[in-house]
């Protein structure tokens, strides 16, 4: 026999959930024990079954989860999962804050990504800082040339998607270019989209030929930097 224990504590590290009104919230407390424990939920210390909540709640015991759709300000509070069996019990608190700000298009920090100059063979990082109430979807694009032209007949540029992810992925806001060559030179765009709309900003990467070692030695102060 074994008292309940958390099977994936790393998935429970995010204690405070601050989400815009209208979003779906999911709290999980994956656990195990012998005998198999049961899970119940409390809101602000009281048994919570969601009967007074518009839209109710979804309890998925096999996933140890509580799901609330279309959260509203009255859903704010402390949500406790209580996991127990005959041997013992454990609990964990989640804090829910419901934000009432007007969701807007993603806002990109001015000046990012920044125009960059690099030498062939070096590594480049292009940075894009995004602020968004709604979870944004990020794409890094490179503007390309097709049949000698940068633009299609419709007047829009040809682009190639280099990287795509949601904002909660690690380092999604950085585009790494390793060991750059002359072909990597050109225009790069960071595009952020959410349910309201898209925003995007671009930067130019200039790639210079490898420095001649003899020339560099003669003029060390003339080295290129970003």
């Amino acid at each position: 026999q074994q008292a309940p224990y958390w099977t994936h504590p790393q998935r429970m590290e995010k204690k405070l959930h601050a989400v815009p009104a209208g979003n779906t919230v999911k709290f999980r407390c994956p656990a195990a024990g012998n005998p198999t424990p049961t899970i119940r939920w409390l809101k602000d210390g009281q048994a919570f079954h969601g009967e007074n909540r518009i839209g109710g709640i979804r309890l998925r015991h096999q996933h140890w989860s509580l799901v609330m759709e279309s959260v509203v300000p009255s859903d704010r509070g402390t949500y406790t999962c209580l996991v127990e069996n005959a041997v013992g019990s454990i609990r964990y608190n989640y804090l829910l804050d419901v934000l009432e700000r007007s969701p807007h298009r993603p806002i990109l920090q001015a000046g990012l990504p920044a125009n960059t100059t690099a030498v062939v063979g070096s590594d480049v990082e292009l940075l894009c800082k995004v602020y968004s109430d709604a979870q944004p979807h990020i794409q890094w694009l490179k503007h390309i040339v097709i049949n000698g032209s940068s633009f299609g007949a419709d007047g829009f540029p040809y682009v190639q998607v280099l990287k795509t992810a949601d904002i909660n992925s690690s380092e999604v806001e950085v585009l790494y270019l390793r060991n750059v060559s002359a072909e990597d030179a050109g225009e790069y765009t960071c595009l952020a989209g959410n349910s309201i709309g898209l925003s995007y900003q671009s930067a130019w990467l200039t790639v210079l030929p490898e420095e001649d070692p003899t020339w560099t030695a003669a003029a060390p102060e003339a080295r290129y930097t970003d």
Epitope: E69, I107, Q135, T164, N194, S195, S199, Y200, Q201
Partner: antibody, heavy 124, light 112 residues
Amino acid sequence: EVQLLESGGGVVQPGRSLRLSCAASGFTFSSYAMHWVRQAPGKGLEWVAVISYDGSNKYYADSVKGRFTISRDNSKNTLSLQMNSLRVEDTAIYYCVRGAGQGYPYGPDGFDIWGQGTMVTVSS
Amino acid sequence: DIVMTQTPLSLSVTPGQPASISCKSSRSLLHSDGKTYVYWYVQKSGQPPQLLIYELSNRFSGVPDRFSGSGSRTDFTLKISRVEAEDVGVYYCMQYIEAPLTFGGGTKVEIK
């Protein structure tokens, strides 16, 4: 051809419920946010709700918050609006509108494609 | 919420003459990405709205070049250089920068 086709409208009594649907075709539905906009008879346009491409984000006008629920089924290319506790003032034509996509916007990033609308009448 | 105020309420125009519709927003619609998110629509009788202009001044595909959009931050204008009979309808401006998305009250354009 890009098309949105609403259905589910009708006459309903105050306090009752109705579910509207919008069938999308001619584009990759799962890559676009989708909106509902309504228009009361002889009046202007009022935005109702939006749902993100994957259904994870939903926003509502204050006038319908807590009563209406927007949802989508990307496997069926369908957008829905569940309308509960209907009021006389909800009487309107309800339009399904394509929102922002996920990729580079070759033109406007949404609000370019509208359905023909479905009429909802709330009356006792 | 951003309020969109449209003037005039109605407009009676002689075919071939210009027409101008004004729209004012209660907050700037100039976004950090440098674009101004005001859209213009026309709604003809019994039909859904049709997009004319997006992002302040870009004509939507298939829209005749007699339609143009201009303005900055909070003051916007839709111009029809030479009105034609088919242009009758109700014209709306819309802000597409934040939720709730909001529309102007509409301007009814008629032919004299």
